[in-house]
Interface confidence: low
């Protein structure tokens, strides 16, 4: 473990949901340290996570200044020796470049994952029920407020709606691109419910995991005649 | 002195899931990797898992699929859950810090502080 | 998966007396990622040494490392009466990071 060879980073991979995004690669750094950097296509580099020992740069607040621009990053391997405190170079002593490894190009509006939704409330009137998905907030600022994973996504988002009845097993669904469904039931039957996110124009991480299942009987439903 | 002191259920059933907690004290979850690893009864040390403060994990592939290893910065504790637990999941559940020191021109990886260890039994 | 061998399983010892323990490895390991534990009954592991041959504060000097590549040894030159437990290799370099079977090291 002498050696001061550095090693190039690999895997690198993006971890990605509702815009919480974290740069993640291999392998654990033996003489050498990590620094980060992060650009849209037509900007400069900007660097983060300086000389770490991890093998991870969370880049949430570089990428949702613009989630709908492409961003490009790369991870450096520094020799440990050049990465004393206070430099604020990445380069060694005669200013030749570390080893790099690019990413892959992120596009946080097309490939952040749709986190778990969850059902806020539901609320029997008669034999309608109105089923109520929390409009989640995301790291996606605008006007110093937090955007909700609606105002983000809009009509793009919808969520899908699986309902049954507690005693029996076959599922309905629902669609709605609110965060609202209005479904008719039988009265006198206890329903279950799971909701799904889903953004349909996408080809891939399309759709989110289901929600927790939600029953009537339970605490978060009202009933009212 | 750092301490990790760590709890969770003790006897579970089949197909249940397992779930423990280890807090750090007398230090911060920063600038660590935090395992948990498991040794059944007479048997050697089996790795489970790893977080880093920031939340990014590995996982030993033989449990992924049955794993879940979480961070809570505000409380200065890290946790474990096994799904869908089987007798073969009976074992001492360790937590530990997974230390990366630099020292004399390398780093070096080694857990050098545990949890005093839970007993887990799983039976019907 | 890198798997650690451990050899041999027991070892029958008096006090004073030297022991050697052996840990291979079926792929060649970065001494920076390779450490030795030991663990008396019913107590957690305690870490013993690092990077192969670096001893962890607190540990007495009889006990030291050596090797690299495949093959690593921990030597505990005098055997006290507290030193008779089961001795674990470890290597946290490659996922899964693993251990090694164990060296049971028992009074003679």
């Known amino acids: 473990s002498g050696t001061t060879n550095t090693v190039a980073a690999y895997n690198l991979t993006w971890k990605s949901t509702n815009f919480k995004t974290i740069l993640e690669w291999e392998p654990k750094p033996v003489n050498q340290v990590y620094t980060v950097q992060i650009s849209t296509k037509s900007g400069d580099w900007k660097s983060k996570c300086f000389y770490t020992t991890d093998t991870e740069c969370d880049l949430t607040d570089e990428i949702v200044k613009d989630v709908k621009q492409t961003y490009l990053a790369r991870v450096f391997s520094v020799p440990w020796r050049n990465s004393t405190h206070g430099k604020e170079t990445l380069f060694g002593t005669h200013g030749e470049e570390p080893p790099f490894t690019n990413a892959r190009k992120f596009l946080p509006y097309r490939d952040t994952k749709l986190g778990q939704p969850t059902i806020q409330s539901f609320e029997q009137v008669g034999t309608k029920v109105n089923v109520t998905v929390e409009d989640e907030r995301t790291l996606v600022r605008r006007n110093n407020t937090f955007l909700s994973l609606r105002d983000v996504f809009g009509k793009d988002l919808i969520y899908t709606l699986y309902y049954w009845k507690s005693s029996s097993s076959g599922k309905k669904t629902a669609k709605t691109n609110t965060n609202e469904f209005l479904i008719d039931v039988d009265k006198g039957e206890n329903y279950c419910f799971s909701v799904q996110a889903v953004i349909p124009s996408r080809t891939v991480n399309r759709k989110s995991t289901d929600s927790p299942v939600e029953c009537m009987g339970q605490e978060k439903g009202e009933f009212r005649e | 002195q750092v301490q990790l002191q760590q709890w969770g259920a003790g006897l579970l059933k089949p197909s249940e899931t397992l779930s423990l907690t280890c807090a750090v004290y007398?230090?911060?979850?920063?600038?660590?990797?935090w395992s948990w690893i498991r040794q059944p009864p007479g048997k050697g040390l089996e790795w489970i898992g790893e977080?880093?403060?920031?939340?990014?994990?590995r996982y030993n592939p033989s449990l992924k699929s049955r794993v879940t290893i979480s961070v809570d910065t505000s409380k200065n504790q890290f946790s474990l859950k096994l799904s869908s637990v089987t007798a073969a999941d009976t074992a001492v559940y360790y937590c530990?810090?997974?230390?990366?020191?630099?020292?004399?021109?390398?780093?070096?990886?080694?857990?050098?502080?545990w949890g005093k260890g839970t007993t887990v039994t799983v039976s019907s | 998966e890198i798997v650690l061998t451990q050899s041999p399983g027991t070892l029958s010892l008096s006090p004073g007396e030297r022991a050697t323990l052996s840990c291979r490895a079926s792929?060649?390991?970065?001494?920076?990622?390779l450490a030795w534990y030991q663990q008396k009954p019913g107590q957690a592991p305690r870490l013993l040494i690092y990077g192969a041959f670096s001893r962890a504060n607190g540990i007495p000097d009889r006990f030291s490392g050596s090797g690299s590549g495949t093959d690593f040894t921990l030597t505990i030159s005098r055997l006290e009466p507290e030193d008779f437990a089961v001795y674990y290799c470890q290597q946290a370099g490659v996922v899964p990071y693993t251990f090694g079977g164990g060296t049971k090291v028992e009074i003679k």
């Open positions: 530990a810090r997974d230390t990366p020191y630099y020292y004399e021109g390398g780093y070096y990886y080694y857990m050098d502080v």
């Open positions: 977080i880093g403060a920031s939340g990014s994990t």
């Open positions: 792929d060649s390991v970065d001494s920076s990622y």
């Open positions: 007398g230090g911060s979850l920063s600038g660590y990797y």
